[in-house]
Interface confidence: medium
Amino acid sequence: MASAGMQILGVVLTLLGWVNGLVSCALPMWKVTAFIGNSIVVAQVVWEGLWMSCVVQSTGQMQCKVYDSLLALPQDLQAARALCVIALLVALFGLLVYLAGAKCTTCVEEKDSKARLVLTSGIVFVISGVLTLIPVCWTAHAIIRDFYNPLVAEAQKRELGASLYLGWAASGLLLLGGGLLCCTCPSGGSQGPSHYMARYSTSAPAISRGPSEYPTKNYV
């Protein structure tokens, strides 16, 4: 029963991670620019995402513009887009694999095969978590590098947007959930059903570490 609980917890975490990842990819808040005047904040904030950029006025009005040409976009933005979409699709595939092998489904009857499918889904979720982490970390690295680069003019300096934090959360949840699903499965590949059941009844929850924490900093 403990393993079933871990499985459910694992899949819930991965589902939360997937939703977070979807929101992170969709929201135009990867990079944020707060235009600062000499002593006052100018009433304009620019949000930049993977698909569009938005200008938010102090009145609350927001104007968004979808990026026109795919080919005209910077390569790192194209790569981030691709990785985001791939990560979401990989996680969906992981979910399908999990459903095929879940304890409560009858797609696969043999317990050992089910265990292997759950393990596979866990690995797929971990891969999805890593794929989510890459564009988020890459973008954050570029933002921080430019922020501290004395050759970069102020208009080109950016801050970390909410989408990046959502992306880190998504990656963490996918890695954690995937890790839990991997931990609920037997280590051997071809043991009989009796070993499988014994392993399940005695398995203790693995201590799973979340993603490494990023130092938070006030940039403005």
């Epitope: 235009f35 600062i36 005047g37 000499n38 100018v42 680069n149 004395p150 050759l151 970069v152 003019a153 102020e154 208009a155 080109q156």
Partner: antibody
Framework: EVQLVQSGAEVKKPGESLRISCKTS????????MHWVRQMPGKSLEWMGG????????HYNQKFQGHVTISVDKSISTAYLQWSSLKASDTAMYYC?????????????WGAGTLVTVSS | DIQMTQSPSSLSASVGDRVTITCQAS??????LAWYQQKPGKVPKLLIS???SLETGVPSRFSGSGSGKDYTFTISSLQPEDIATYYC?????????FGGGTKVEIK
């Protein structure tokens, strides 16, 4: 006393290569980024690009990207501007100027300039 | 790129006159503006940064004002040693760009 001493005037033919220098003294070299500014005869000033002497990162004006190379030798506190193939349109006065590392991007001190003449 | 339009391109005034030079950016530069003086055959010298802040050692007859896209440089009482070309420069956005310059002469 802060000094940005530039190399002497150069007369070159189109297609030739050239490297001009800007030797600095009187301040901590790594506390300022070094930049090059072009002034064509009778014209205004144009920022060409700059370099961070701490990590050798460069930032170019797109107009000059690929045509010139900016470099530094930290050991002798000197900045360089280099062309691999000069054109007649490169005839101008070239100034090196510094920008405070932790400040805004304006030039607080300039070299005396190097006149480059490219003529066949 | 941000275009800096400086006017007039040249002016002639008498000693003691008030001289005003304007600089207009093609977009808002959020007070990230510097003014330089270049005397004939000499190197540019920084006079003002942040649109209004006078650099150390610069005479108080020089001043700067403005915001948004429009900025003004003023010499309250023109002196013979002020004969020079004056340039504005924006440092809000890369590439850093200069105005076309204003040549100031004595009548």
């Amino acid at each position: 006393e802060v000094q940005l001493v530039q190399s002497g005037a150069e007369v070159k033919k189109p297609g030739e290569s050239l490297r001009i220098s800007c030797k600095t003294s009187g301040y901590t070299f790594t506390e300022y980024t070094m930049h090059w500014v072009r002034q064509m005869p009778g014209k205004s000033l144009e920022w060409m690009g700059g370099i961070d002497p701490n990590n050798f990162n460069t930032h170019y004006n797109q107009k000059f990207q690929g045509h010139v190379t900016i470099s530094v030798d930290k050991s002798i506190s000197t900045a360089y501007l280099q062309w691999s193939s000069l054109k007649a349109s490169d005839t101008a006065m070239y100034y090196c100027a510094r920008i405070y590392y932790f400040g805004r991007l304006y030039f607080d001190f300039w070299g005396a300039g190097t006149l480059v003449t490219v003529s066949s | 790129d941000i275009q800096m339009t400086q006017s007039p391109s040249s002016l002639s005034a008498s000693v003691g006159d008030r001289v005003t030079i304007t600089c207009q950016a093609s977009e808002d530069i959020y007070n990230r503006l510097a003014w330089y003086q270049q005397k004939p055959g000499k190197v540019p010298k920084l006079l003002i940064s942040g649109a209004t802040s006078l650099e150390t050692g610069v005479p108080s007859r020089f001043s700067g004002s403005g915001s948004g896209k429009d900025y003004t440089f003023t010499i309250s009482s023109l002196q013979p040693e002020d004969i020079a070309t004056y340039y504005c420069q924006q440092y809000w956005s890369a590439p850093l760009t200069f105005g076309g310059g204003t040549k100031v002469e004595i009548k």
